[in-house]
Amino acid sequence: LIIGFGISGKHFITVTTFTSAGNIGEDGTLSCTFEPDIKLNGIVIQWLKEGIKGLVHEFKEGKDDLSQQHEMFRGRTAVFADQVVVGNASLRLKNVQLTDAGTYTCYIRTSKGKGNANLEYKTGAFSMPEINVDYNASSESLRCEAPRWFPQPTVAWASQVDQGANFSEVSNTSFELNSENVTMKVVSVLYNVTINNTYSCMIENDIAKATGDIKVTDSEVKRRSQLQLLNSG
């Protein structure tokens, strides 16, 4: 959470941003809020990126103006125009690229004054893991798969029954480059699993942490997955 202040004569407004992460190839949001102003035509929003000449996006007089936009953002940006009057200057970013990572500035000018705040935007790839029982294996094993990760994550297994056990000797993890040559598919196999136990496959890089749980009993298989972005907010 970053709060910035600006001074215009005697007037300053508070601008607030949140550090966030973007998933390559998906759509992202760079969050920014400011003190609302009912005079839409008097609001100017500028998004800038450190090291880039030109703007990421500009919204003024109630509409977009991309005449100064840097070409790397062409066709990929928009503000939530109907929410600007209530103080939302967040930026939509289409088709997030690895090169979109960096420091952004959200600059606001209204009839009340002006202000700005920076945010760090991280980019990578992260996805939910899915665990299945691998019945083809000679001994009962679990297969944990996640389709898109970058940078290369670490993978670890855990078990409810054998808490603290190191499963690295009885697991095998591989990383397969996807067709776009950036992200990778993660596959990890855990061997010699026992029935009536809950196993967890944990995949983590510096952007996200994902966990897949599976409980195998004689009568059923229960699964659960969750994904958490790291250092956000």
């Epitope: 190839g25 977009d64 103006d65 991309l66 005449s67 062409r74 928009a78 939509r92 088709n95 067709s179």
Partner: antibody, heavy 121, light 107 residues
Framework: QLQLQESGPGLVKPSETLSLTCTAS??????????WSWIRQHPGKGLEWIGN???????YYNPSLKSRVTMSVDTSKNQFSLKLSSVTAADTAVYYC?????????????WGRGTLVTVSS | DIQMTQSPSSVSASVGDRVTITCRAS??????LAWYQQKPGKAPKLLIY???SLQSGVPSRFSGSGSGTDFTLTISSLQPEDFATYYC?????????FGGGTKVEIK
């Protein structure tokens, strides 16, 4: 209500330059919320996006045509134009001008009627 | 470039039929897909944007679904004015590309 209308020669000789203009009426192409595109359709075939232009004059061209395409805009006349050089029979098509529905959406919500350009000697 | 593959290339149907057209992208495009209707001698008309959003003025019998690489256009009850060619278009990555089209003909 905004309307688009293409104009230009219907017949162009091989190796010459195809020139088309799209005139907007009932609205301004200087509205910052839109990109303006050219799209073509070969006879009986599918659609091919040629490129787009912003009111400020910045452009993006389809790499397959980039070496031959030039787009320009004249906001005082509320027009934008397409030039395609060194044409061959393969450039015979109906050419459409169109509006992208927003700065991010890149779907085409408003089209001209289209103009058939034949490349022949 | 992202390739857009439509199927079938043509379909014969009767008034009142439910018609489904599919479009597959060669790589993930999230929900950045549009559908158009084109009648002979006319410009294409936008029906669906963002995979499932109905363009203003388009009848509710048209619907779109899908995300990632696989998308569907459905006409719930075919009307006489719906006989036309339909195109999908990816709006995710430059250069924007269209599918080859699906012609909906009278059976």
């Amino acid at each position: 209500q905004l309307q688009l209308q293409e104009s230009g020669p219907g017949l162009v000789k091989p190796s010459e330059t195809l020139s088309l203009t799209c005139t907007a009426s009932g609205g301004s192409i200087s509205h910052g919320g839109y990109y303006w595109s050219w799209i073509r359709q070969h006879p009986g075939k599918g659609l091919e996006w040629i490129g787009n232009i912003y009111y400020s004059g910045s452009t993006y061209y389809n790499p397959s045509l980039k070496s031959r395409v030039t787009m320009s805009v004249d906001t005082s006349k509320n027009q934008f134009s397409l030039k395609l050089s060194s044409v061959t029979a393969a450039d015979t098509a109906v050419y459409y001008c169109a509006r992208e529905s927003s700065t991010i959406s890149a779907d085409f919500d408003l089209w001209g009627r289209g103009t058939l350009v034949t490349v022949s000697s | 470039d992202i390739q857009m593959t439509q199927s079938p290339s043509s379909v014969s149907a009767s008034v009142g039929d439910r018609v489904t057209i599919t479009c597959r992208a060669s790589q993930g495009i999230s929900r950045w897909l549009a559908w158009y209707q084109q009648k002979p001698g006319k410009a294409p008309k936008l029906l669906i944007y963002a995979a499932s959003s109905l363009q203003s003025g388009v009848p509710s019998r048209f619907s779109g679904s899908g995300s990632g690489t696989d998308f569907t256009l459905t006409i719930s009850s075919l009307q006489p004015e719906d006989f036309a060619t339909y195109y999908c278009q990816q709006a995710h990555t430059f250069p924007y590309t269209f599918g080859g089209g699906t012609k909906v003909e009278i059976k």
